[in-house]
Amino acid sequence: YNLDPQRPVHFQGPADSFFGYAVLEHFHDNTRWVLVGAPKADSKYSPSVKSPGAVFKCRVHTNPDRRCTELDMARGKNRGTSCGKTCREDRDDEWMGVSLARQPKADGRVLACAHRWKNIYYEADHILPHGFCYIIPSNLQAKGRTLIPCYEEYKKKYGEEHGSCQAGIAGFFTEELVVMGAPGSFYWAGTIKVLNLTDNTYLKLNDEVIMNRRYTYLGYAVTAGHFSHPSTIDVVGGAPQDKGIGKVYIFRADRRSGTLIKIFQASGKKMGSYFGSSLCAVDLNGDGLSDLLVGAPMFSEIRDEGQVTVYINRGNGALEE
């Protein structure tokens, strides 16, 4: 890619809002947008909520003053709104816009998440940072769909199961799957929440070995691609704190059993490198299969210069570094 440093298009958001923390290109009806997450912004649509964050839409072409406007997600202004039988939401400092993803099709919808969203139903005992995601329609106007993938009725323990999962710290959208990283599940072993939009069910990660690896942060980064076959979608999750060096897993989304089945794993090389904290699935060699780039931003040979490891797909989920 060639970058043009001479004539950049420059969009600006509110001060101290972390405007630009997540950025996404979106198009709908011949209009191109840049969507920008500002996870520490105040929201004009929820003035009584403390810095919930916001997603801004910036029109790319006919927009001479480079104005960006906040998306209205129709989320109301109350603290303690019911979100289920044992669920009351607290949106203060929820970090809406921490991650953004787009469904890869003409009328693709947009996924926007707030990983610090909290369920305060049991606040006398536990405040549960489940995390929250919102599916925005392609036109960026109509009301969308709310997702709290970690909420389960009558479950109230912080740390245990999905109590503090913080879903949405990372997100990815395929045509049929909504993939949300949840690094706080199972005492921060982490997990990946995958919603199949075709039948509105979640695919489960039942791998005991992974679920018992506490404090590894699986789900800190997620992506998806064609790893086992050009026509199937597999899900990738990074666990940057695994054994201190970081790990990445690829899972097959098995529709029949409704589960995620591990088909590949790779580990980082250096302690503290945070290997797996960023991921990119891309076909580098044009063979129809996704290859994988894994970021390790704290990798240090000289001084925390970081490293990207490239894995080339040899077929059937066998990747070669």
């Epitope: 129709a74 989320r75 109350n78 019911s82 009301k143 769909r145 709310t146 039948d199």
Partner: antibody, heavy 120, light 107 residues
Framework: EVQLQQSGAELVKPGASVKLSCTAS????????VHWVKQRPEQGLEWIGN????????KYDPKFQGKATITADTSSNTAYLHLSSLTSEDTAVYYC?????????????WGQGTSVTVSS | DIQMTQSPASLAASVGETVTITCRAS??????LAWYQQKQGKSPQLLIY???SLEDGVPSRFSGSGSGTQYSMKINSMQPEDTATYFC?????????FGGGTKLEIK
């Protein structure tokens, strides 16, 4: 444009059953829940139940359990309400409505209603 | 089941007058309340959801408020086209239940 088109009025005999339809346009019913609501002449609104068309899961008011069956056909973007063993108490207008998958939302679009008259 | 008690059952107001309709739930419904308007011979229409959020396209003279078990809807300046029956509905727990309705007429 979002629309819910309901089937025409029905005149049925006591003891018979009837199946009402609700066809959506302008949106995919798999992205919503479809609800059915009953309104007897000059009376209030009663929630019958709903369906998640993506997987067929249903919820009913216990009062209508056994009386009403809600189904959906995603290929035709249509939801159905089947009412059985009809009596004069079932004479009413039946509405379908959509509810976006939004936990603090409500029924934002309604069909025009289908009038069911039970009479011998 | 959660009971919704709506009052008054009917009222008449002059054009420009402020109208308030209230709804009481038999238990805390945590803002899970919607208000609907139904004109004679027509389907209900959503006015307010989440207790105080105005539905797109609804005139700003309509507003909702309340919390816990007590909720109300206000019409700031009654207009002839506001003649209708108004229903509240709780969406906190299944079965969802409606209030008995308030028939609003013009004086």
């Amino acid at each position: 444009e979002v629309q819910l088109q309901q089937s025409g009025a029905e005149l049925v005999k006591p003891g018979a059953s009837v199946k009402l339809s609700c066809t959506a346009s302008g949106f995919n019913i798999k992205d919503t829940y479809v609800h059915w609501v009953k309104q007897r002449p000059e009376q209030g609104l009663e929630w019958i139940g709903n369906i998640d068309p993506a997987n067929g899961n249903t919820k009913y008011d216990p009062k209508f359990q056994g009386k009403a069956t809600i189904t959906a056909d995603t290929s035709s973007n249509t939801a159905y309400l089947h009412l059985s063993s009809l009596t004069s108490e079932d004479t009413a207008v039946y509405y379908c409505a959509r509810w976006l998958r939004h936990f603090y939302y409500a029924m934002d679009y309604w069909g025009q209603g289908t009038s069911v008259t039970v009479s011998s | 089941d959660i009971q919704m008690t709506q009052s008054p059952a009917s009222l008449a107001a002059s054009v420009g007058e402020t109208v308030t309709i209230t709804c009481r739930a038999s238990e805390n419904i945590y803002y899970s309340l919607a208000w609907y308007q139904q004109k004679q011979g027509k389907s209900p229409q959503l006015l307010i959801y989440n207790a105080n959020s105005l539905e797109d396209g609804v005139p700003s003279r309509f507003s909702g408020s309340g919390s816990g078990t007590q909720y109300s809807m206000k019409i700031n300046s009654m207009q002839p086209e506001d003649t209708a029956t108004y229903f509240c509905k709780q969406a906190y727990d299944v079965p969802y239940t409606f209030g008995g309705g308030t028939k609003l007429e013009i004086k």
